[in-house]
């Protein structure tokens, strides 16, 4: 339980960092989160008893002792950041925000038919931060249905005035909405030459990649290694942006990295957690504390539960002394990032794991997983859930994928004759089905949703959602999977798995344990050659050997098709249908989720 | 070096009460958030309570809610666990650490413990 409440009429006194406007004290509420430093805020709402210059000014605030001294004051809200709390934060805004104007700069006037489009649009232009769509009733006959595309240094309005008849929102990116391309490659000897909006220090091109993706101007980076022959530019990190949203001119050059901002594909990767450590590494910056620990991950657990910590580097022990413990120092910057890194000194250093939580809680890391055999080990896979059925008597069903705390991602026609979800029990982390005994916790089943283009497997949309009657707390067993992003539909998967407990053959009988086969994935085209006699959609995929000899099969059906890339899982495909099992030239055909994302999205967050 | 030293545990009836201490040196206490933390005889750990570093913010596991209050004083240093209406399955020793529990928390550093005792 965390501070989550906002305090009414209520203003915290001193403390200032910065103000930004935003259209609401809960949207406020969320820079702060994302604000290096910010812990509580004060936000002033519209009221006849303030001044209209100061309506949503949203000022972010600091305290050593996390708290500031309360006055009363009408119109004021404020509250804390979720940095104090434990619980999964997003930065996806949906509201749309009547008769507010949210300034900033203009680059783009167009027509559009209605505030939802002006929202798309936005959300699929790299520059845009936010809109304001002026509605058909709006007074000046020129502007009726124009679509305002905007952007500021910060993401956030310059300043927000009332204003009649239209509708104001911001960008869905981070929604996971956009249909932009995303861009993981990273650029060896290669610098862009655009236009700095900023620059931090970082300890490696990864670090400077994920800074980028949540700084709301830069669009790509150049990252200067420590082996960068000029010793002032070594580990910096330069932010960058160009009109055209690409970089204008790439020059070759040693020691040098660049990339792209990976705001397009944010949700499947991790952004915010610099989770490695650094060795022979100093990060510079203000001190917090310093304390005796025991190794540099005991040293990055005190940074993380002190709420101010950003960073810290750990001195090892000396032989003997000590009682063996290191030194560990706990830093914060004005930004987040080190003021100066330094190497060759013997400190390890490395990130607070606080903002982890800013992540999907599916870019964690997993256990690593035996490869050969066909057999699963425990925590393996573990998004898949075995989902059974009570009538007329208890048996597994079908498989699907953990893909948030309250759902479950699996095929239509899993639910053939079941009449009521009343019968359905959702079993996780489970590798044998002889675990599950009368006593065995599981999720019911409050909601199905079948997807309503759903007629059979072979013609397409066999896809479900369960609503789960109960969260799911996330361990090493139970987890989520990532969906695959919609910018990465051009990527292509060559670490594939396909996990059930189905079928090893035709006739066959459910397997006890955890069933894992590698399978390549084979193009639409020569998928449809396979198949004369069914239509092979772009909504669906195909994976298979052409000798056949692996596949899954009946029983498998709602479970994953599970890719690796990245060092991140994604569920890239779910177990639909095949003609036989195995079989020569015939490949499995699996649900494509890529392209069902905003489906599942839709569906999974709507109030 | 850091020390944390835990005390005000001992037996005691069902119902009854007890005040649990953590006193804590070798850090600035101050800064960071705290938990209880317990371990019943043969079982695992088991996250009771946490506090934030400011103190306005607690939370409880639903095993002690309504039973327990966890309590601060950053002048001394010293990290406190109030309960009462003990019951059986309260018996464990008792542990203070630096963090809210969270999963990302785990792992702090640790004192001895202070065994609590429930008896029927």
């Known amino acids: 339980e965390c501070v989550t409440q906002l305090l009414k009429d209520t203003c915290f006194e001193g403390g200032d960092i910065t103000t930004v406007f935003t259209p609401s004290a809960k949207y406020c509420q969320v820079v702060c989160t994302y604000h290096p430093r910010c812990l509580l805020f004060t936000f002033t709402a519209e009221s006849p008893s303030e001044d209209p210059t100061r309506w949503f000014t949203c000022v972010l605030k600091d305290s050593v002792t996390e708290t500031l001294p309360r006055v009363n004051r009408t119109a004021a809200i404020s509250g804390y950041s979720f940095k104090q709390c434990s619980h999964q934060i997003s930065a996806c805004n949906k509201d749309i925000y009547v008769d507010l104007d949210m300034k900033g700069i203009n680059y783009n006037s167009s027509v559009a038919k209605s505030a939802q489009e002006c929202q798309e649009r936005c959300t699929d232009d790299v520059h845009c931060h936010f809109f304001t769509y002026a509605t058909r009733q709006f007074p000046s006959l020129e502007h009726r249905n124009i679509c305002l595309l905007k952007h500021t240094q910060t993401g956030t309005p310059t300043r927000i005035t009332k204003l009649d008849k239209v509708v104001s929102g911001f960008s869905l990116k981070s929604c996971a909405l956009s249909n932009l391309a995303c861009i993981r490659d990273i650029f060896p000897n290669t610098v862009f030459a655009d236009s700095n909006i900023d620059s931090v220090m970082a300890p490696d091109a990864f670090v400077c990649g994920r800074i980028c993706t949540h700084h709301p101007g830069c669009l790509f980076f150049t990252f200067f290694s420590q082996e960068w022959p000029k010793e002032s530019q070594r580990n910096l990190c330069l932010l960058k942006t160009s009109e055209s949203g690409l970089p204008s001119t790439r020059i070759k050059k040693s020691k040098a990295l660049s990339g792209f901002s990976l705001q397009s594909c944010r949700h499947s990767i991790p952004v915010f957690c610099h989770s490695s450590f650094y060795h022979d590494t100093d990060f510079l910056g203000e001190e917090l504390d310093i304390v005796a620990a025991k190794s540099h991950e005991a040293c990055q657990k005190l940074c993380t539960n002190a709420v101010r910590c950003q960073f810290f580097t750990y001195t090892p022990a000396q032989a003997s002394c000590n009682e063996g413990k290191g030194k560990c120092y706990l830093k914060l910057s004005s930004n987040g990032s080190p003021t100066k890194i330094l190497h060759g000194r013997g400190g390890i250093s490395g990130y607070t794991l606080r903002l982890c939580k800013m992540d999907n809680e599916c870019t964690t890391k997993i256990k690593p997983r035996i490869v050969g055999g066909t057999a699963s080990v425990r925590g393996e896979w573990p998004w898949q859930v075995t989902l059974h059925t009570t009538s007329p008597t208890q048996r597994h069903l079908c498989g699907g994928s953990i893909i948030g705390n309250q759902w479950i991602l699996t095929a239509a026609h899993c639910f053939y004759g079941v009449e009521s979800p009343k019968i359905l029990r959702v079993y996780s982390g489970i590798l044998n089905q002889s675990e599950i005994k009368e006593d065995t916790s599981f999720f019911g089943v409050q909601e199905i949703i079948i997807h309503d283009q759903y007629k059979m497997a072979e013609s397409g949309y066999d896809i479900a959602l369960l609503k789960l009657e109960t969260t799911v707390n996330y361990t090493d067993s139970q987890r989520p999977i990532c969906l695959p992003s919609k910018g990465d539909r051009n990527v292509i998967y060559t670490d594939c798995w396909v996990t059930g407990w189905g079928y090893r053959k035709l006739r066959d009988k459910i397997q006890n344990t955890l069933q894992k086969a590698k399978i390549p994935l084979v193009t639409n085209e020569e998928c449809q050659k396979r198949y004369r006699g069914h239509k092979i959609t772009h909504k669906m995929i195909c994976a298979g050997y052409r000798e056949g000899g692996k596949d899954a099969c009946k029983g498998d059906s709602g479970g994953p098709l599970s890719c690796k890339h990245n060092e991140v899982w994604h569920l890239v495909g779910i177990t639909s249908w095949g003609e036989g099992c195995a079989q020569r030239e015939r490949p499995g055909v699996y649900t494509n989720v890529v392209e069902y994302v905003d489906w599942i999205l839709e569906k999974t967050q709507a109030v | 070096q850091v020390q944390l030293q835990e005390s005000g545990g001992g037996s005691v009836q069902a119902g009854g009460s007890l005040r649990l201490s953590c006193a804590a040196s070798?850090?600035?206490?101050?800064?960071?958030?705290w938990s209880w933390v317990r371990q019943a005889p043969g079982k695992g750990l088991e996250w009771v309570s946490a506090?934030?570093?400011?103190?306005?913010?607690?939370s409880y596991a639903d095993s002690v809610k309504g039973r327990v209050t966890i309590s601060r004083d950053n002048a001394k240093n010293t990290l406190y666990l109030q309960m009462h209406s003990l019951k059986t399955e309260d018996t464990a020793v008792y542990y203070c650490?630096?963090?809210?529990?969270?999963?990302?928390?785990?792992?702090?550093?640790w004192g001895q413990g202070t065994q609590v005792t429930v008896s029927s």
């Open positions: 506090i934030n570093s400011g103190g306005g913010v607690t």
């Open positions: 650490a630096t963090g809210d529990g969270g999963s990302w928390y785990r792992d702090g550093d």
């Open positions: 070798g850090l600035r206490f101050s800064i960071y958030d």
